[in-house]
C-alpha cells in the first residue's frame, strides 16, 4: 500500500478534517469538568480523574488506553501540624504568624482537600534567626550581596521574591550561601499587573494568595529515590539521605500581605539599587535583621511537611500507525494540579482531550495516521516531572529507537496576547508552515494568518519577517524526552505581552485562585485562544505522524549552531589573556559547524530529489532525520548532571526554566575569574570545546550519504 492508501483519505483533506473537528465549546466543557475539585498528585481524586480520562479516551476511539503506575517520593503538609512563619520577641513569644491557608475563592468555600500553600520537599525544621532580603535569590543577587556588599547569609533566614528563575534554583543558591531557612513570597511588582483588579474581580494576585511549588534540584533525575530507573514494584530505593535533589533547609511560601509584615521591619543595609525594590510600601532593606526598635525580634519558621512514597498514575493512549507503527509521535501533558488547576494544567489537558476526540473521530471514519501517535496524561509533574520521567525511564529502549517527536501540552495559556513556541530547530519550518495555514484569533487580525499576528507581536530578534521561537529549557514534561533521550520536542501556548507585562508567569500561578472562572471570565471567554493552541499542538502532531517525509529541516539546526558558536566564542574572548596563555582554540568548533552546514545543505538537496515511492530509501532518509536529534546526545551527560545529555541545549544551571546553548562550555566559563586553579578551569573549557566540536561533527556525519 502507498502511504496515501493506508491513510484512506488524501493528506490535505486529513489535516483539514482533523482541524475542523476541533471545537472551542468542547475545550470549555472539558476544562470545566477537570477543574471542579483539586487533583493533587498521589490523591484519590487524581486517580479517579485518571480512570475517567482512560474511559473517555477509549470512547473517543483510541486503540488502547492503559494506566501506568509508579511509586515515587512525594511531599505533603502535616494535616494536624500546619506550617507557618512567626516573628518572635526576645522572650520567644510569637507576636505575628503568617496565614495557614489562602481565603477560598467565591463558590469554593466548602471544597475539601485544598492543600495549604507549602514548598514541596522542604525538610522539617524550626529555624529562628535574623532575616536577609536577597531579591530574587539569583546567582547574581548572591554575588551582589556577598562580593559587593560583604553581607554574609550564613546562619540567616533569607527572604526572596518569586520570579525570574525557578524556585529550586533560589533554594539551592540560598543553601550554598549558608542560609538556614528560606521564605519565598510573591511581590506585587512581579505578580500584580497595574490597572487590573485582584481575583475574583480580575486576574491579579490578592494579598492572601500564595504560589505553591516544588523546590527540588533534580537535574532531570525523576523520582529522587530511583534516579535512572523506573519506580516500579521491584525498584531498589535509595535512603532519604542519598535521595537526589532534596533541599537541606526549611522553605515556605507566603503572600504579599504576610511579606509586608516581615519586610517592613527590615534594617541593615539599604537596597543596592532600584532593581532590588518591589512594589510594597517597605524600604526593601537587605538586613541582616530588623531595624532599631525591633532589633531584638527574630523570625522563626515552623515546617512539619513529610516526604512519602506514593502511587501515581499516567494515562497512556495509543493510536496505531498504519504504515510505520514502530515510529512514535507523542503528545503529552500533565493532569495533576496544586489545587483546581484552572490554567496549570487543565487548560492544557482540556486541549489534549479535544485533540484525542478529533483523532478518534477520524479513526472511526476509517482513517489512521501513518505513524503511531501516543497520548499521555502525566501525573506528578508538579512534584518534579515524575510521571513522565518514570514512564520514559521504563520505556527508554523503545523511545530511543522509535521516538520521532514529543509535543508538550501543559497550560494552553499564560496570557492572551500572542503565540509562544519553544522547540528544537528541526521543527522551525513545521511551525512556520503550520501557523501560515491557521487563522489568527487576535483582535485586529481578522482574516489574517496566525503566522502574521505572531510575527507582528513577537518578531524574531535575528530574522526580519519571522516570529521569535525560543530554546527549550525545562520545568515541564518534555525534559526527559529532549534533554535525556534526544527526541525532537516542542511546546506552544498563548502568552502575554512581555514588553508591557514584566510580572513573572501569570499572577495566580499555583494559587487557589487558578479556577475555571479565572479562564472563562478573564483570559479566554470564547475559548478562541485555547482552540488556536489546540490547532497548533494538534496540527504539529498530525504533520509529524502523517507526512510522508518527516517535516524536519536540518538546515535550521546549522543556522543556530553557528549562532551559538559565535555567542560562546564571544563570551570566552572576554578573557583574552587567559585564552592566549592557555591556548584556548575554538577552531575545532567552528570547523565542525562549517562541516555540519555543508552536509545539512547536501542532505536537504537529496531530500528533495530522492524517489519517495521507494519505501526503503524513504525510511532511510526519515531515520536520518529522526536520529539527528539523538546524535546530539552525549552518553556521559554534562558535568555533574548525568541526565542532561544534550550537548547543544540544557536547562540553565542558574534557572531550570531557561535553555542554555553549548551548556558544557558555558558552565565551564561561568565565573571563571573566581576559580582558585585557573589552569584547571581553562583546561575544562578546552575539554568542553572538544566535546562540543566532536558532537557537532558526529551529528553532521549522520546526515552524510550512508555509503
Amino acid at each position: 500500500k502507498s502511504s496515501n492508501e493506508a491513510t484512506n483519505i488524501t493528506p490535505k483533506h486529513n489535516m483539514k478534517a482533523f482541524l475542523d473537528e476541533l471545537k472551542a465549546e468542547n475545550i470549555k466543557k472539558f476544562l470545566y469538568n477537570f477543574t471542579q475539585i483539586p487533583h493533587l498528585a498521589g490523591t484519590e481524586q487524581n486517580f479517579q480523574l485518571a480512570k475517567q480520562i482512560q474511559s473517555q479516551w477509549k470512547e473517543f476511539g483510541l486503540d488502547s488506553v492503559e494506566l501506568a503506575h509508579y511509586d515515587v517520593l512525594l511531599s505533603y503538609p502535616n494535616k494536624t501540624h500546619p506550617n507557618y512563619i512567626s516573628i518572635i520577641n526576645e522572650d520567644g513569644n510569637e507576636i505575628f504568624n503568617t496565614s495557614l491557608f489562602e481565603p477560598p475563592p467565591p463558590g469554593y468555600e466548602n471544597v475539601s482537600d485544598i492543600v495549604p500553600p507549602f514548598s514541596a520537599f522542604s525538610p522539617q525544621g524550626m529555624p529562628e534567626g535574623d532575616l536577609v532580603y536577597v531579591n530574587y535569590a539569583r546567582t547574581e543577587d548572591f554575588f551582589k550581596l556577598e562580593r559587593d556588599m560583604k553581607i554574609n547569609c550564613s546562619g540567616k533566614i533569607v527572604i526572596a521574591r518569586y520570579g525570574k528563575v525557578f524556585r529550586g534554583n533560589k533554594v539551592k543558591n540560598a543553601q550554598l550561601a549558608g542560609a538556614k531557612g528560606v521564605i519565598l513570597y510573591s511581590d506585587p511588582a512581579d505578580y500584580f499587573a497595574p490597572g487590573v483588579k485582584s481575583y475574583p474581580d480580575g486576574w491579579n494576585l490578592p494579598g492572601g494568595g500564595v504560589q505553591r511549588g516544588n523546590i527540588l534540584n533534580l537535574n532531570g533525575a525523576g523520582d529522587p529515590l530511583t534516579p535512572g530507573y523506573p519506580a516500579n514494584e521491584y525498584a531498589y530505593r535509595r535512603g532519604i539521605a542519598e535521595a537526589v535533589g532534596l533541599p537541606s533547609i526549611p522553605v515556605h511560601p507566603i503572600g504579599y500581605y504576610d511579606a509586608q509584615k516581615l519586610l517592613e521591619k527590615m534594617g541593615g543595609s539599604a537596597p543596592p539599587d532600584s532593581s532590588w525594590r518591589g512594589s510594597l510600601k517597605v524600604p526593601y532593606n537587605v538586613g541582616p535583621g530588623f531595624t532599631g526598635n525591633f532589633s531584638t525580634q527574630k523570625v522563626k519558621m515552623h515546617i512539619h511537611s513529610t516526604n512519602e512514597v506514593t502511587r501515581i498514575y499516567n494515562v497512556i493512549g495509543t493510536l496505531r500507525g498504519a504504515v510505520e507503527p514502530d515510529r512514535y509521535v507523542i503528545l503529552g501533558g500533565h493532569r495533576d494540579s496544586w489545587v483546581f488547576g484552572g490554567i496549570d494544567p487543565q487548560s492544557g489537558a482540556a486541549v489534549v482531550h479535544e485533540i484525542v476526540r478529533s483523532f478518534g473521530t477520524l479513526k472511526k471514519e476509517g482513517w489512521r495516521p501513518r505513524r503511531t501517535i501516543l497520548f499521555a496524561s502525566w501525573d506528578a509533574e508538579e512534584f518534579g516531572l515524575l510521571g513522565s520521567t518514570e514512564w520514559a525511564e521504563e520505556n527508554s529502549r523503545l523511545l530511543q529507537e522509535r521516538g520521532v517527536a514529543y509535543i508538550n501540552a501543559d497550560s494552553s495559556i499564560e496570557g492572551n496576547y500572542t503565540l509562544r513556541v519553544d522547540c528544537t530547530p528541526l521543527m522551525y519550518s513545521l511551525v512556520h508552515n503550520l501557523t501560515k495555514e491557521l487563522k489568527s484569533p487576535d483582535e485586529g487580525f481578522e482574516g489574517k494568518s496566525l503566522y502574521e499576528s505572531w510575527t507582528k507581536k513577537s518578531p524574531s530578534p535575528e530574522f526580519s519577517g519571522m516570529p521569535r521561537i525560543s530554546k527549550l529549557g525545562s520545568g515541564n514534561d518534555f525534559e526527559v524526552f529532549f534533554q535525556r533521550l534526544g527526541i525532537a520536542s516542542g511546546r506552544a501556548r498563548y502568552t502575554k505581552n512581555w514588553e508591557t507585562n514584566k510580572f513573572s508567569g501569570y499572577p495566580l500561578y499555583h494559587s487557589v485562585y487558578e479556577t475555571y472562572e479565572l479562564v472563562e471570565k478573564f483570559y479566554d471567554p470564547m475559548f478562541k485562544y485555547h482552540l488556536t493552541v489546540a490547532q497548533v499542538r494538534g496540527g504539529m502532531v498530525f504533520e509529524l505522524a502523517n507526512s510522508i517525509v518527516l517535516p524536519f529541516d536540518c538546515r535550521d539546526y546549522a543556522v543556530v549552531l553557528r549562532k551559538y558558536a559565535d555567542k560562546i566564542y564571544s563570551i570566552s574572548m572576554k578573557h583574552p589573556q587567559e585564552m592566549k596563555t592557555y591556548s584556548v582554540s575554538f577552531d575545532s568548533l567552528f570547523s565542525a559547524v562549517k562541516n555540519f552546514t555543508e552536509i545539512a545543505s547536501k542532505f536537504s538537496e537529496r531530500l528533495q530529489d530522492f524517489d519517495k515511492s521507494n519505501p526503503i530509501v524513504l525510511r532511510m532518509m526519515n531515520d536520518q532525520l529522526m536520529f539527528l536529534e539523538r546524535a546530539f546526545i552525549d552518553p556521559l551527560g554534562l558535568p555533574d548532571r548525568p541526565f542532561y545529555r544534550h550537548v547543544i541545549y540544557a536547562p540553565s544551571s542558574h534557572n531550570k526554566y531557561a535553555g542554555e546553548s553549548f551548556p558544557g562550555i558555558y558552565d565551564a566559563l561561568f565565573d571563571i575569574e573566581s576559580k582558585v586553579d585557573p589552569s584547571k578551569a581553562w583546561g575544562e573549557v578546552k575539554r568542553q570545546i572538544y566535546v562540543a566540536a566532536f558532537t557537532v561533527q558526529a551529528a553532521a556525519e549522520t546526515l552524510s550519504e550512508v555509503a
Epitope: 555567542k567 566564542y569 564571544s570 577552531d587 559547524v593 562549517k594
Partner: nanobody, 113 residues
Framework: EVQLLESGGGLVQPGGSLRLSCAAS????????LSWVRQAPGKGLEWVSS????????DYAAFVKGRFTISRDNSKNTLYLQMNSLRVEDTAVYYC??????WGQGTLVTVSS
C-alpha cells in the same frame, strides 16, 4: 596558513575617529567569529568586541559600547573596527583574533592631544 594583518592605527586627538581593518587569509573567513582585543601600555590584554557570521551578531565591552562599531565584509575577507569619540585611555595596540589562538601582529592607536 592563517594570516591576520591589521592596519589603520595612528595618532589621533581625543574625540577623534579611526577605522581599523584586519585583512584575513588562509582560512574560510565567513565560517568564523572574530574579535578585537587591545593591550594598553604596561597593561594586560583587554577584549573590545566580537562579531559573528554577519553584522547582526555583535558584542561589545561596556567601555566602548556606543562609541565603537565592529563589522565585517565576507566578500573581502576583512574585519573592521570603527572607533569614534576616542579617549586617551583607548591608547593601545589593537589585535584582530580568530578562534582564540590566531592573532594578528597588532596596530598601534595613540590618542593624545
Amino acid at each position: 596558513e592563517v594570516q591576520l594583518l591589521e592596519s589603520g592605527g595612528g595618532l589621533v586627538q581625543p574625540g577623534g575617529s579611526l577605522r581599523l581593518s584586519c585583512a584575513a587569509s588562509g582560512f574560510s573567513f565567513s565560517s568564523y567569529a572574530l574579535s578585537w582585543v587591545r593591550q594598553a601600555p604596561g597593561k594586560g590584554l583587554e577584549w573590545v568586541s566580537s562579531i559573528g557570521e554577519n553584522n547582526h551578531t555583535t558584542d561589545y565591552a561596556a567601555f566602548v559600547k556606543g562609541r565603537f562599531t565592529i563589522s565585517r565584509d565576507n566578500s573581502k575577507n576583512t574585519l573592521y573596527l570603527q572607533m569614534n569619540s576616542l579617549r586617551v585611555e583607548d591608547t593601545a595596540v589593537y589585535y584582530c583574533v580568530k578562534d582564540g589562538v590566531h592573532w594578528g601582529q597588532g596596530t598601534l592607536v595613540t590618542v593624545s592631544s
